[in-house]
Structures are given as structure tokens and as C-alpha cells.
């Protein structure tokens, strides 16, 4: 597809906002050379892609933000993969670098003469995209421009650093955050001993470095850690669970910093390989409460406990998109496609390279059938709101009792519009307050979500706490029947009294034998046994010595009774 | 640590019988344990195995005429409706692993006949 | 579903020869295979575990290889007491599953 025409989708505007989404799904092992992407998306695509067009709608027709000012789009889709959406933010950027004395609309030749071609108005920022490694290149091309990019669930720990990504903005909090969540469940169940997955690729492994360093300071061993990436081949799902049942019995417990299609390659792994309940994930929110993770793997996800950003669903959102027809919405250019995948008909006049399906689509069809919305839509809108918001500041302070476009913003300053987007707070799509601290990050509010059996073959998440300001809350009668339902995820069970821990040669610290301290010895501490002194007794309870009462003989008392050798 | 299979006996078709396989110096909260058959100059035939977990996995010929279950010291096999094609030395085996790798302890077997 | 077939079903080799048994897995199980001896009137014993580690007490005649569907066991230098039938059996999957173990290579010894 690299030498495929890409599709973009457009909105006209007097301020055009890029936005890079995955409408596809990212190419396979075998098609990354030629960055051919995967199966058209529709929570993390189309959805988001509707939801940008629906709310620069809302936005331009809202009196009171940008007046007399039109939004416009370039929506181009990232594929979940660097290479894609590098090549996608080079379009975005080329035909729209004009000088600040060039005329707007205008390209000069290079001989002097002017042209009638119109240029592309330039971006002034983008939103997105999706994943953090595809963002971090992303933000390496755009910062050259000064161009801003807020992210709606980019949430890495290292686009916090202002130093290396100074034009990077989000409306979702650092990974730091959902580590220290995570932590502090496996902490909550004294699971002590965990393995531990991450997905290969800046999100997972910043993530389960703070997750692996936040362990340890709270004395959670790892009994091993692997990585992997989403679009591994089966072999090597395969093979990872293999190496995850090496640590059974003692490490149950998965901690999975991972995408959603990762967790996917490990359910249908655990279905192959017959070790369905074999293990609880405790998964990050690249999982959150993602139907598109456990369609048809339900008895393999059955007891996972996931983190999820706190994100209300977005009513109107709805209202809008499940109206939506193929027949009637041209300005999507993926529509179409998604249609015919969502519902595996085909639509009569449309080109289909393979008529890879069979029956024409019936008109009755609707979104509503099966609709669930993209987990993340309060953050795309939020994104798209922050940077009108940002426009508006940067609008009233340059152009003051002026509506519309003054010459001030033209063409607009993208270090003005940083520092004014930096700045920026309003009353977001859920009520809650969106701010950006000095690194450009939002405050973390997390829900802790719970998979499970609601009925034969009728599975669901449900919330069963919340992480917010360093604060757990846990239900736990929700999550375990009964108590004694509490998996266990540990190395070595407490020593009896009177016993120390071995740690073997080479083990973690979470796994010892326990080895019981000799006839004089207590003990001093977990891992030491000491000798009682001449003349004292290790006490009953092993922690200490008393001294030996002496007892005097005395003139009148029995003579000691004593064995010689000779007594056979 | 050793493994050893019982109730092997002459049963008639249709009938229930459960093998019962008692092991020593082995916690079977740690590993997994298959039950293995085979028929008089035939080859091993993998029946099933329960994990260290409880979970039990059958071969696909199985369905539903044997059931593995555990207690802490002894590993079960139900056979339910038993024909004369079930007639085979019965033998437990130890996983090396809390799920399924490689038997590296073996019981010594228990005869069932089916014969009317 | 999952199977696994032996070749030759049975063979004669002369003490002190070599004897070469090979497996088949009808889909990649990595280098999850394993090779029991057995003889009349015992239970098998484990001989390779993972394709190719010798189990404790297994001696060094006993060679296998391979890895994703396909498997080879050696015997060299054969002796008396390795007349015996040899399983192999695969260790990667118990889901849709017709039998872990091969059909088994009876081997005399000449």
C-alpha cells in the first residue's frame, strides 16, 4: 500500500486541525515492508474520525467559541504504525509550509512567476494519534514545524520529557499513573509473585519499567519478564505461553502493559494451547473494556482486572453517529468500506477490489445493531475541544475585540498557540476539568474494570473500583465470590514459627525454603537463626532466649540420678 | 515419590467404574497428572490430564465417558458407559509442569476388562 | 484437530548399529516433543524431554532433534536392552487433541 494513494478525509476551514487515527488495523509481520494496513477499525477508526467531523460541526456552529471563525479537518489514518503515519505527517506538512511573507493561497516558481495552483492551507495543529510509539515519530517531524499535537491516548511516561517533545500536548495522564494503579491492586491481594508482559514499542516498555521499578520498591517480585509485539505471528503467542506455564503454580498472576490486540494474541494463545483459566491478567488500559480484545476468547479473559481511563460515554456522540448511512455520509471516505465490513455485505456500486462478500447489504441495516462506543471518545472530543479552546485564548489575546482572523494569525504562530494551549482549561465532554500541567499532561482518574461470567456464555466487564490521586478503591466481593476464591500468586508460603527463609543461589527474594533454626537457636530475624548464650534457652515461641534457672543441691536432696557408660 | 493406580477390575458394558491413582511425596497443587491407556498390544493412548489449577482437558475422542478429578492426595478416573473397547492397562503420570510438558513419573498401571 | 505420526512402525537393527525413528506433528508445537521407551510389561519411561534433553539417568546413546512439526530420535551403538517400542509424544497443546503420543516404533535388536 505504500505506493497506494492514501485516502483523507477533508473539512473545509479558515483554520484547518490535522488528526491521525486508526482507521485500519496496523499491517501484519508479512506486510510491514510494504505498510500495507489491516482490517478497516471501527471504535479506534471510524468512530473517531465521525467524532472529529461531528465536533468541529459543534464547534462552528457554538457563538461563543472561535466566532466567526470555521474549524476545517485533514483526517489521514495512522494504521497503528510508525512508518504509516510518519509518511501520513509528511503530507500534512509538505504543501503547506508557506513563509510568513508568502501570500496565502499562492505558490511562487522557482524562476519568479506566480501560480495559479492553490496551496493547502497549512495545519496549524494535530490530533492524535492513537498509540505512543507512532506518537513519539509523529512529534519528532511535527516539533521541526512547531507544530502542536495533543494526544488522546498516547500516554506514555516519556512524552512527559518538554526537553525531547516540547510541542506534545494530551488529555489523558503519563503511564506513570496506571503503573502505580496496577501496583497497587497486586499489592491489595498480596500476590507477590507475578509474571509479567508487555507489548514491544514505547507504551508497554516505559510502562512496565515503572510498573517492574514500583514493584520492587514494594517487595513484588517478577518471576519473569516478556515482550512481545501485537502483530507477533501465532507461533509466538505460542510460545510466550509456554514460557508463562513454566512459572505456574507460583505465578498466576499476568501483569500485562499491553495493547489491546497484544491481550487478544494471548486469549487465543491460552484457547490453542488449552490453558483457559490457567491465569488472571491484570491488564493496562490499552485493554480497559475493550469488546474488540475477548469477541469470541470470553472464557479465556473470564477474572482479568483492567485498568480503564475514566471516560463517561459521550450521549450526543451517539445520537449522531448511529443515524449515520452509507448512502448518505460521502464526507468519510472509509465509510463505505466499514460498512461492508462491519455488516460482511457489499454495497451495490461500490468498487470492491475483491467482492470479498457475497450477499448485497440489506437497507434495514443500523449502527445501532452491536453498538458499542470507543472507550476513549470522551478523549478524542476533549483533544479536539482543547486545541479550539487554544485557538479561541490565542484569538481573543492577539486579535482583542476583533472577530474572526486578524493578521496577527496570519498564518498562525505554532509557539503562540503552544503557550496559549498550554494555558488552556475549560469544563470537558464528562464535566471534569481539563488542564494541562507544565509537562502538557492531565491529571490520571482511572477505573478498575473486572471480566466476568454474568450468565452462561454471557460474559461482561463490570466496574469494581477506581484509582484516582493515588487513592485505591476495591470491591472486592465483587471481583471474589468468597475469600477463599482469591488467587494466590506467590513464590513461597510463610515459614512456620521457629523456621528462617533460604533464599537458593540466584532466586528472587520472594522465593525461599524454610529451614527450621537449631535446638539452642532462636529466631533472630526472617533470615537468621542465632545460639542462646551459655547458660540460656531459645523461649517457647523462638524469639528470644531465657536464662536456665541454676538449681543448688542441697544437703538432704536425692542423689542426681545419672548413667554411666559402662550401664548397658 | 512414586504413583499408584487402582480399581482396575472386570466390568461389564455400560457399567461405572473409577480408577483411583494414589501418589506419595507429591503435591499435586504443584503439577499436573494425565491418565494414559493402553490396549492389550496397542499404543499409548492419552486420555486427560487436570492441571495444578483443577482444570481438566480430554482428548477429543473422549466425550464425556471419562471425568479426571483430585483430591490432595489421590488423582480420579471415572469411566461412565464402558465398552469393550475401553478394555486397556490404565496408568497415571506425573507432568513435570502445573499444566502440560513431559510424564517423567509413571505408575505402574491397573487392568480393566469389559466383557458381558 | 492435533496428531502425531511415527515412521517406520517397526525395525530391526544389529547390536551396535544405529537406528534412526521419526516423528511428525501435524502443526508447529516449537521443540515441545518428547520421547518414551517402553518395555513389555512396563510403563514408559521418559528418555528426551523438549526434543532434545536426555532425562537423569539416560544415556548418552540416545540422541533427538528437530523442532516445529518435524522430530528425529537416534539410537547409536544399540545394544540388547534397547529392544523396546519408542513414543513420542507432544507437549504443546491439550485443546482439540486426538492423542498426544505417536503411534509408537517398535525397535528389535538383532
Known amino acids: 500500500q505504500s505506493s497506494e494513494r492514501r485516502v483523507v478525509a477533508h473539512m473545509p476551514g479558515d483554520i484547518i486541525i490535522g488528526a491521525l487515527f486508526s482507521v485500519h488495523h496496523q499491517p501484519t509481520v508479512d506486510k510491514v515492508h510494504e505498510r500495507k494496513c489491516g482490517a478497516v477499525r471501527e471504535q479506534y477508526g471510524i468512530q473517531r474520525v465521525e467524532a472529529m467531523l461531528h465536533t468541529l460541526e459543534r464547534i462552528n456552529s457554538d457563538p461563543t467559541l472561535l466566532p466567526n471563525i470555521t474549524l476545517g479537518c485533514e483526517i489521514r489514518d495512522s494504521c497503528w504504525h510508525s512508518a504509516v503515519a510518519l509518511e501520513q505527517s509528511i503530507e500534512f506538512i509538505r504543501d503547506s509550509l508557506i513563509s510568513s511573507e508568502e501570500e496565502e493561497g499562492l505558490v511562487r516558481c522557482v524562476d519568479g512567476s506566480s501560480s495559479s495552483f492553490r496551496s493547502k492551507k497549512p495545519i496549524v495543529g494535530v490530533i492524535g494519534p492513537g498509540s505512543s510509539s507512532v506518537a513519539i515519530q509523529v512529534q519528532n517531524l511535527l516539533q521541526l514545524f512547531n507544530i502542536p499535537q495533543i494526544a488522546y491516548s498516547a500516554t506514555s511516561m516519556d512524552l512527559s520529557d518538554k526537553t525531547l517533545f516540547k510541542y506534545f500536548m494530551r488529555v489523558v495522564p503519563s503511564d506513570a499513573q496506571q503503573a502505580r494503579a496496577m501496583v497497587d491492586i497486586v499489592k491489595r491481594y498480596n500476590w507477590t509473585y507475578v509474571s509479567a508482559v508487555h507489548t514491544e514499542g514505547n507504551y508497554g516498555e516505559s510502562g512496565m519499567e515503572a510498573f517492574k521499578d514500583m514493584s520492587a520498591k514494594e517487595g513484588i517480585c517478577i518471576a519473569h519478564s516478556y515482550k512481545i509485539y501485537s502483530n507477533a505471528g501465532e507461533q509466538s503467542f505460542d510460545k510466550l505461553l509456554k514460557k508463562l506455564t513454566s512459572h505456574l503454580p507460583k505465578a498466576r498472576v499476568v501483569a500485562c502493559f499491553c495493547e489491546g490486540m497484544t491481550v487478544r494474541g494471548l486469549l487465543m494463545a491460552m484457547r490453542r494451547l488449552g490453558l483457559a483459566g490457567e491465569f488472571l491478567l491484570l491488564g493496562s488500559d490499552g485493554w480497559a473494556d475493550r469488546y474488540d480484545v475477548t469477541d469470541g476468547y470470553q472464557r479465556e479473559a473470564v477474572g482479568g482486572i483492567t485498568i480503564k481511563l475514566q471516560s463517561p460515554d459521550v450521549k450526543w456522540f451517539d445520537d449522531y453517529y448511529l443515524k449515520l448511512r452509507p448512502e448518505t455520509n460521502h464526507r468519510n471516505p472509509w465509510f463505505q468500506e466499514f460498512w461492508q465490513h462491519r455488516f460482511q455485505c457489499r454495497l451495490e456500486g461500490f468498487p470492491q477490489e475483491n467482492s470479498k462478500y457475497n450477499k448485497t447489504c440489506d437497507s434495514s441495516l443500523t449502527l445501532k445493531t452491536h453498538h458499542v462506543q470507543d472507550s476513549k471518545m470522551g478523549f478524542v472530543i476533549n483533544a479536539i475541544y482543547s486545541m479550539a479552546y487554544g485557538l479561541h485564548n490565542m484569538q481573543m489575546s492577539l486579535c482583542p475585540g476583533y472577530a474572526g482572523l486578524c493578521d496577527a494569525m496570519k498564518p498562525i504562530d505554532g509557539r503562540k498557540l503552544l503557550e496559549s494551549l498550554m494555558k488552556t482549561n475549560f469544563t470537558g465532554v464528562s464535566g471534569d476539568m481539563i488542564l494541562f500541567d507544565e509537562n502538557g499532561d492531565s491529571p490520571g482518574r482511572y477505573e478498575i474494570m473486572n471480566f466476568k461470567e454474568m450468565g452462561k456464555d454471557y460474559f461482561d466487564y463490570i466496574n469494581v473500583g477506581s484509582w484516582d490521586n493515588g487513592e485505591l478503591k476495591m470491591d472486592d466481593d465483587e471481583v471474589w465470590s468468597k475469600k477463599s476464591n482469591i488467587i494466590r500468586s506467590v513464590c513461597s508460603e510463610p515459614c512456620e514459627k521457629g523456621q528462617i527463609k533460604v533464599i537458593r543461589k540466584g532466586e528472587v527474594s520472594c522465593c525461599w525454603t524454610c529451614t527450621p533454626c537449631k535446638e539452642n537457636e532462636y529466631v533472630f530475624d526472617e533470615y537468621t537463626c542465632k545460639a542462646c548464650q551459655l547458660g540460656s534457652w531459645p523461649t517457647d515461641d523462638l524469639t528470644g532466649c531465657d536464662l536456665i534457672p541454676v538449681q543448688y543441691l542441697r544437703w538432704g536432696d536425692p542423689e542426681p540420678d545419672y548413667k554411666d557408660d559402662d550401664d548397658k | 515419590q512414586s504413583l499408584e493406580e487402582s480399581g482396575g477390575r472386570l466390568v461389564t458394558p455400560g457399567g461405572t467404574l473409577t480408577l483411583t491413582c494414589t501418589v506419595s511425596?507429591?503435591?499435586?497443587?504443584?503439577?499436573?497428572m494425565s491418565w494414559v491407556r493402553q490396549a492389550p498390544g496397542k499404543g499409548l493412548e492419552w486420555i486427560g490430564i487436570?492441571?495444578?489449577?483443577?482444570n481438566t482437558w480430554y482428548a477429543n475422542w473422549v466425550k464425556g465417558r471419562f471425568t479426571i478429578s483430585k483430591t490432595s492426595t489421590t488423582v480420579d478416573l471415572k469411566m461412565t458407559s464402558p465398552t469393550t473397547e475401553d478394555t486397556a492397562t490404565y496408568f497415571c503420570?506425573?507432568?513435570?509442569?502445573?499444566?502440560?510438558?513431559?510424564?517423567?513419573?509413571w505408575g505402574q498401571g491397573t487392568l480393566v476388562t469389559v466383557s458381558s | 484437530a492435533f496428531h502425531m505420526t511415527q515412521t517406520p512402525a517397526s525395525m530391526e537393527v544389529a547390536v551396535g548399529g544405529t537406528v534412526t525413528m521419526k516423528c511428525q506433528a501435524s502443526?508447529?508445537?516449537?521443540?515441545?516433543l518428547n520421547w518414551y521407551q517402553q518395555k513389555p510389561g512396563q510403563p514408559p519411561k521418559l528418555l528426551i524431554y523438549?526434543?532434545?534433553k536426555l532425562a537423569s539417568g539416560v544415556p548418552s546413546r540416545f540422541k533427538g532433534s528437530g523442532s516445529g512439526t518435524e522430530f528425529t530420535l537416534t539410537i547409536s551403538g544399540v545394544e540388547c536392552a534397547d529392544a523396546a517400542t519408542y513414543y513420542c509424544?507432544?507437549?504443546?497443546?491439550?485443546?482439540?487433541?486426538?492423542?498426544?503420543f505417536g503411534g509408537g516404533t517398535e525397535v528389535v535388536v538383532k
Open positions: 503420570a506425573r507432568d513435570s509442569s502445573a499444566t502440560f510438558n513431559y510424564l517423567d513419573l
Open positions: 511425596g507429591i503435591d499435586l497443587s504443584s503439577y499436573a
Open positions: 487436570i492441571y495444578a489449577s483443577g
Open positions: 502443526e508447529s508445537i516449537d521443540t515441545y
Open positions: 523438549q526434543a532434545s
Open positions: 509424544q507432544q507437549g504443546w497443546s491439550t485443546n482439540d487433541v486426538d492423542n498426544v
